[in-house]
Interface confidence: low
């Protein structure tokens, strides 16, 4: 049987580093394939070579392995605003990133979307825009932070969190709340 994935890691540890246990004969340790190649046939016996083949165009392996197939090269997600930083090679996947003055917002471990860094209009930059984090803005007096933009306190309603920041101004804003609120 092909081992369960957890078992496979345990069984690999029986062999020295850079080798793996033969799936049909656990007394044989075969040499892993170099990055850029994949396992075509297990080694026939002790001290004999593993049959590794180079990855075909459009596929890669980035580390020594005993994978039966190379991995398909990633394509940058244009609909997420991604751009290609470096092309796929046999031993390295495509590297995708964002344009200048953009940051990555990760929706999941492997999926990110590119967004423009906030410019902190009506405020100052507290922390510069990073690869994976938007600019952190501090707003000038008379403005409050909403979705990382400095918005005029005239748009602050008593029911919102901004009331603390806009307290001096809020008294001058009339008729913007329902009459039932206090």
């Amino acid at each position: 049987l092909v081992p369960h994935l957890g078992d496979r890691e345990k069984r690999d540890s029986v062999c020295p580093q850079g080798k793996y246990i033969h799936p049909q004969n656990n007394s044989i340790c075969c040499t892993k394939c170099h990055k850029g190649t994949y396992l075509y046939n297990d080694c026939p016996g002790p001290g004999q070579d593993t049959d590794c083949r180079e990855c075909e165009s459009g596929s890669f392996t980035a580390s020594e392995n005993h994978l039966r197939h190379c991995l398909s090269c990633s394509k940058c997600r244009k609909e997420m605003g991604q751009v290609e930083i470096s092309s796929c090679t046999v031993d390295r996947d495509t590297v995708c990133g964002c344009r200048k003055n953009q940051y990555r917002h990760y929706w999941s471990e492997n999926l990110f979307q590119c967004f423009n860094c906030s410019l902190c209009l009506n405020g100052t930059v507290h922390l510069s825009c990073q690869e994976k984090q938007n600019t952190v803005c501090t707003c000038h007096a008379g403005f409050f932070l909403r979705e990382n933009e400095c918005v005029s306190c005239s748009n602050c309603k008593k029911s919102l969190e901004c009331t603390k920041l806009c307290l001096p101004q809020i008294e001058n804003v009339k008729g913007t709340e329902d009459s039932g609120t206090t």
Epitope: E9, L67, R68, H69, L71, S72
Partner: nanobody, 119 residues
Framework: EVQLLESGGGLVQPGGSLRLSCAAS????????MGWVRQAPGKGLEWVSQ????????YYAHSVKGRFTISRDNSKNTLYLQMNSLRAEDTAVYYC????????????WGQGTLVTVSS
């Protein structure tokens, strides 16, 4: 959103055949190797079969080799598993999955289809 929808499971007698299908959507099907894994009642996951993105390479667990055939139709975004000479020990929930080759290699799973082999 990635979706994998398996079908074709059911009750079959020992020695019988079934063909499982997996309809894929929400990702570029042609880009990925695909696989089938199964989980027998009360047991862990077992890797059953795998097929490269262009269908030129296939791989089978020794327990199913010669009896099961994996295939794919990239024009229909569908993965198949033809299961012949079924045995009681093939009883399991069969999952279609996208193979990424990392140590958590099946990043996306379907909901599974139950295959019961019993007389």
């Amino acid at each position: 959103e990635v979706q994998l929808l398996e079908s074709g499971g059911g009750l079959v007698q020992p020695g019988g055949s079934l063909r499982l299908s997996c309809a894929a959507s929400g990702f570029t099907f042609l880009k990925y190797s695909m696989g089938w894994v199964r989980q027998a009642p009360g047991k862990g996951l077992e890797w059953v079969s795998q097929i490269s993105n262009t269908a030129d390479r296939t791989y089978y667990a020794h327990s199913v080799k010669g009896r099961f055939t994996i295939s794919r139709d990239n024009s229909k975004n569908t993965l198949y598993l033809q299961m012949n000479s079924l045995r009681a020990e093939d009883t399991a929930v069969y999952y279609c999955a996208i193979y990424t080759g990392r140590w958590a290699p099946f990043e996306y799973w379907g909901q599974g289809t139950l295959v019961t082999v019993s007389s």
